[in-house]
């Protein structure tokens, strides 16, 4: 058992059918000695009597608030929820499995930019009595600090007949160094409640593998004369890094059809402009990315060739 | 060239060498689905690694006040990872196959190195760590180990030099 | 602590209608009131619910048929066009007090509401 | 999501004991009541945290099983306890929220 935070404690349970559970000593805050009774959640049903109250934790009907009272009057509170362990994994019944970039991913991190701050999102089908609590920090064995807000429900979808919830949180490390080479790595560590169970979830990476950039701005085309070619032109994204000279940016322009089976065009370019042909109801689209780290592509901005 | 003492380097050759550094180091090792190999265990492989870090005035305002610290960094780095590469890591089995990048990545880090050092000159290199694991297996998670932390390296050293031959070059 | 259903009446297919649910003894502030009917013969079935803080959930079946408002001693449930399928009781309960999504322990004796032509 | 309750309906004879099985389509953890109803009355808590006994309710009725298995046991059975049994998950609106089908039990 340890302390989640004041008067809430998380009991560690092997779960299996019979398994013998843990036996918590639960200690009531006050000077009082005699004419102190227990009792859990709602029920006025007195589970012991004395300063402190034994009981063995097996299943989720034996955690909850332990209240201790004397005289009618409440001495004390302690919130018991429970952490599953089954087959040595710890339980992962609370966010889903977001398969992305591999198994086993509940948490998805994304930066648009080296200056330290990144978002992260996780998903969830439970809409009701669900709590998140985010820290995070710089390596784990001499943490450097990284200060996250409160995640806050960023996005609803509907999914068949079940609603599914999105989770996003904001941090920012306290220290960042933009233009060095990251050696320790950003961990963060989600501790959500349901109900009475507690689960935690983790993610490590560095800053430069989580890098998308946002789409280029100001797309624009310019018709060449007497040719169906036009000039493409594009401005680094506002959220990006600067300097552009040492923050620099690689683009890709790709010319499409109406019909997505249409071959597409594509051009990869240094530059923040480029030539290319325009055909009659294509589109223009052109997308971000890291020039020296093949992290991810920022999503496409687009300007029909019309 | 740099010449250590003060001169600055041909700013545009070594953008064009670093860049060309980004691409081999890529293509030697994409990006297999985002094989996480820090959770094999990192600590006693890519510690001992020299990281441009915060102090080594590689960023832009510290390229503007003395470039050479930064570039003794990214010396020593290239002369460690040209060391690393060359090495039964790297030779010995599973081979590498015979169109394989990291030839290329070899003699490319030699060729930067040489850019920023010439002959005659020397800054101070960092010992190489041996590493000479005992199964292919542990050589294959080691080569996969030693280029994610290349590609890291030298995207910081290009950013250096872009930088460099944008705002720095005579 | 006792809750109880009101305005349960034989109104025509589309005609709206409100029910209520007058409660005393306990604050709505500090508990979950639901919604659920049980046609002739049948299950019960719930039709949504809103919490101590106001917030409203319905059962994926309502899309959009009934709408669940509080004042601070009543809670509302509007059945937009009723059809002659919405024709059951309808009962209002309390929740314990422990969570959102909880079970019930204060129950309405519940109002019938008759749809037909 | 969905609960079954099995059987829809028992026949069990006074001072005997009958079992009502309750499955939920996903796991509920221990998210699970069960009520009572007799005709022309609202239900009755009788379990929650599907063991729990509800204030006022005999002893008589127990309810065990956690994930998705739940099992409500009635010994002693007298003719009052002849009604409909549901069982209820509240484990989440969203994710698992809801009525069973319903036991109807009859006492001979």
């Known amino acids: 058992i340890w302390e989640l935070k004041k008067d809430v404690y998380v009991v560690e349970l092997d779960w299996y059918p019979d398994a013998p559970g843990e036996m918590v000593v639960l200690t009531c805050d006050t000077p009082e000695e005699d004419g102190i009774t227990w009792t859990l959640d709602q029920s006025s049903e007195v589970l012991g009597s004395g300063k402190t109250l034994t009981i063995q934790v097996k299943e989720f009907g034996d955690a909850g608030q332990y209240t201790c009272h004397k005289g009618g009057e409440v001495l004390s509170h302690s919130l018991l929820l429970l952490h599953k362990k089954e087959d040595g994994i710890w339980s992962t019944d609370i966010l889903k499995d977001q398969k992305e970039p591999k198994n086993k991913t509940f948490l998805r991190c994304e930066a648009k930019n080296y200056s330290g701050r990144f978002t992260c999102w996780w998903l969830t089908t439970i809409s009701t009595d669900l709590t998140f609590s985010v820290k995070s920090s710089r390596g784990s064995s001499d943490p450097q600090g990284v200060t996250c807000g409160a995640a806050t429900l960023s996005a609803e979808r509907v999914r068949g007949d079940n609603k599914e919830y999105e989770y996003s949180v904001e941090c920012q490390e306290d220290s960042a160094c933009p233009a060095a080479e990251e050696s320790l790595p950003i961990e963060v560590m989600v501790d959500a409640v349901h109900k009475l169970k507690y689960e935690n979830y983790t993610s490590s990476f560095f800053i430069r593998d989580i890098i998308k950039p946002d789409p280029p701005k100001n797309l624009q085309l310019k018709p060449l004369k007497n040719s169906r070619q036009v000039e493409v032109s594009w401005e680094y994204p506002d959220t990006w890094s600067t300097p552009h000279s040492y923050f620099s940016l690689t683009f890709c322009v790709q010319v499409q059809g109406k019909s997505k089976r249409e071959k597409k065009d594509r051009v990869f370019t240094d530059k923040t402009s480029a030539t290319v042909i325009c055909r009659k109801n294509a589109s223009i689209s052109v997308r971000a990315q890291d020039r020296y780290y093949s992290s991810s592509w920022s999503e496409w901005a687009s300007v029909p060739c019309s | 060239r740099a010449v250590p003492g003060g001169s600055s380097p041909a700013w545009t050759q070594c953008q064009q060498l670093s860049q060309k550094l980004c691409t081999l180091a890529w293509s030697a090792h994409p990006l297999v689905g985002h094989m996480d190999l820090r959770e094999e265990g990192d600590e006693e492989t890519t510690n001992d690694v020299p990281h441009i870090q915060c102090g080594d005035g590689c960023d832009p305002q510290g390229l503007r006040d003395n470039s050479q610290f930064c570039l003794q960094r990214i010396h020593q780095g290239l002369i460690f990872y040209e060391k690393l590469l060359g090495s039964d890591i790297f030779t010995g089995e599973p081979s590498l196959l015979p169109d394989s990048p990291v030839g290329q990545l070899h003699a490319s880090l030699l060729g930067l190195s040489q850019l920023l050092q010439p002959e005659g000159h020397h800054w101070e290199t960092q010992q190489i760590p041996s590493l000479s694991p005992s199964q292919p297996w542990q050589r294959l998670l080691l080569r996969f180990k030693i280029l994610r932390s290349l590609q890291a390296f030298v995207a910081v050293a290009a950013r250096v030099f872009a930088h460099g031959a944008a705002t720095l070059s005579p | 602590q006792s809750v109880e259903e009101s305005g349960g009446r034989l109104v025509t297919p589309g005609t709206p209608l409100t029910l209520t649910c007058a409660v005393s003894?306990?604050?709505?502030?500090?508990?979950?009131m639901i919604w659920v009917r049980q046609a002739p013969g049948e299950g019960l079935e719930w039709i949504g619910i809103?919490?101590?803080?106001?917030n409203t959930y319905y059962a994926s079946w309502v899309k959009g048929r009934f709408t669940i408002s509080k004042t601070s001693t009543t809670v509302d449930l509007k059945m937009i066009s009723p059809t002659t399928e919405d024709t059951a009781t309808y009962f209002c309960?309390?929740?314990?007090?422990?969570?959102?999504?909880?079970?019930?322990?204060?129950w309405g004796p519940g109002t019938l509401v008759t749809v037909s032509s | 999501f969905e609960l079954t309750q099995t059987p829809s309906s028992v026949e069990a004879a006074v001072e005997g004991t009958v079992t009502i099985k309750c499955q939920a389509s996903?796991?509920?953890?221990?998210?699970l009541s069960w009520y009572q109803q007799k005709p022309g009355q609202p239900p009755k808590l009788l379990i929650y945290?599907?063991?729990k006994l509800a204030p006022g309710v005999p002893s008589r009725f127990s309810g065990s099983g956690s994930g998705t298995q739940f099992t409500l046991t009635i010994g002693d059975l007298e003719c009052a306890d002849a009604a409909t049994y549901y069982c209820?998950?509240?484990?989440?609106?969203?994710?698992?929220?809801?009525f069973g089908g319903g036991t109807e039990v009859v006492v001979v």
């Open positions: 309960a309390r929740g314990s007090g422990a969570y959102i999504s909880d079970y019930f322990n204060v």
């Open positions: 209820q998950s509240y484990y989440d609106v969203n994710a698992g929220y809801g």
């Open positions: 809103i919490s101590s803080s106001g």
């Open positions: 003894g306990f604050s709505l502030s500090g508990y979950t």
């Open positions: 945290s599907a063991s």
């Open positions: 996903q796991s509920i953890d221990s998210w």
